[in-house]
Interface confidence: low
């Protein structure tokens, strides 16, 4: 495991996988940043998703002092998005194409979260908001929103792992 007993993760491995995640997240919806996604109820669907914030210890100083705070936050986010990508929002109609990168994205989120999960230790994971859109267009809209926030999340995570690989690797 990457983090046996709460020690440092395999920063380089995490960096590589987080870079792959970034690529997959953008190829899953490259134009998502240009879409007009303002809709009724926008707040409730996007406020619940994990964000990496200033107090999460993901800045260079925080990582140097105790990287576990930041890594736990990233781990929570990875599990959260992994569950969302495996939910009815992505598995229901409209169906994904066989060559869609969402499946690979889903697997890679799980892979990175496993790299971060310490042996014999289970970090608390965040509850997924109950989102059960009934109409295909609502589901599609939610996918856009989820992928957009996932793109932001993995971009920050990739920067964290790049910094860790450069400065904190043994």
């Amino acid at each position: 495991r990457a983090v046996p007993g709460g020690s440092s993760p395999a920063w380089t491995q995490c960096q590589q996988l987080s870079q792959k995640l970034c690529t997959l997240a953008w190829s899953a919806h490259p134009l998502v940043g240009h879409m007009d996604l303002r809709e009724e109820g926008d707040e409730e669907t996007t406020n619940d998703v994990p964000h990496i914030q200033c107090g999460d210890g993901c800045d260079p100083q925080g990582l140097r002092d105790n990287s576990q705070f930041c890594l736990q936050r990233i781990h929570q986010g990875l599990i959260f998005y992994e569950k969302l990508l495996g939910s009815d929002i992505f598995t229901g109609e409209p169906s994904l194409l066989p060559d869609s990168p969402v499946g690979q994205l889903h697997a890679s989120l799980l892979g990175l979260s496993q790299l971060l999960q310490p042996e014999g230790h289970h970090w608390e994971t965040q509850q997924i908001p109950s989102l059960s859109p009934s109409q295909p267009w609502q589901r599609l809209l939610l996918r856009f929103k989820i992928l957009r926030s996932l793109q932001a999340f993995v971009a920050v995570a990739a920067r964290v792992f790049a910094h860790g690989a450069a400065t904190l690797s043994p």
């Epitope: 879409m35 869609s100 295909p136």
Partner: nanobody, 126 residues
Framework: EVQLVESGGGLAQAGGSLRLSCAPS????????MGWFRQVPGKEREFVGV????????YYADSVKGRFTISRDSAKNTVYLQMDSLKPEDTAVYYC???????????????????WGQGTQVTVSS
């Protein structure tokens, strides 16, 4: 101006297959969705299915779900409608339609599309 050019129509036996193609021409296509509709004489044009260009999400009318498959080839800038297990009631003129990227709404109605092809005849004989 974008022109949509359909091809692949023709005569098929019931239970057989056909593949229609739709290629935008005139300028580089950057639409958000490509839909397929069909029309029989004297009836309104009916939604068949749609693919969201970026991301490749698909959605189908109940009447064709499980039999028809829409796909896209980004390199060739072409959308395909694979029609399997054809029935005589699938006989119609099939139209390709494109929507420009002004919204993420899921377009299933005629008025939501900006560009239309000239149509290609599909005849299914029993």
């Amino acid at each position: 101006e974008v022109q949509l050019v359909e091809s692949g129509g023709g005569l098929a036996q019931a239970g057989g297959s056909l593949r229609l193609s739709c290629a935008p021409s005139g300028r580089a296509f950057s639409g958000s969705a490509m839909g397929w509709f069909r029309q029989v004489p004297g009836k309104e044009r009916e939604f068949v299915g749609v693919i969201i260009w970026t991301g490749g999400y698909t959605y189908y009318a109940d009447s064709v779900k499980g039999r028809f498959t829409i796909s896209r080839d980004s390199a060739k800038n072409t959308v395909y409608l694979q029609m399997d297990s054809l029935k005589p009631e699938d006989t119609a003129v099939y139209y390709c339609a494109a929507r420009t990227p002004n919204s993420s709404w899921f377009p299933t109605t005629l008025y939501e599309y900006d560009y239309w092809g000239q149509g290609t005849q599909v005849t299914v004989s029993s």
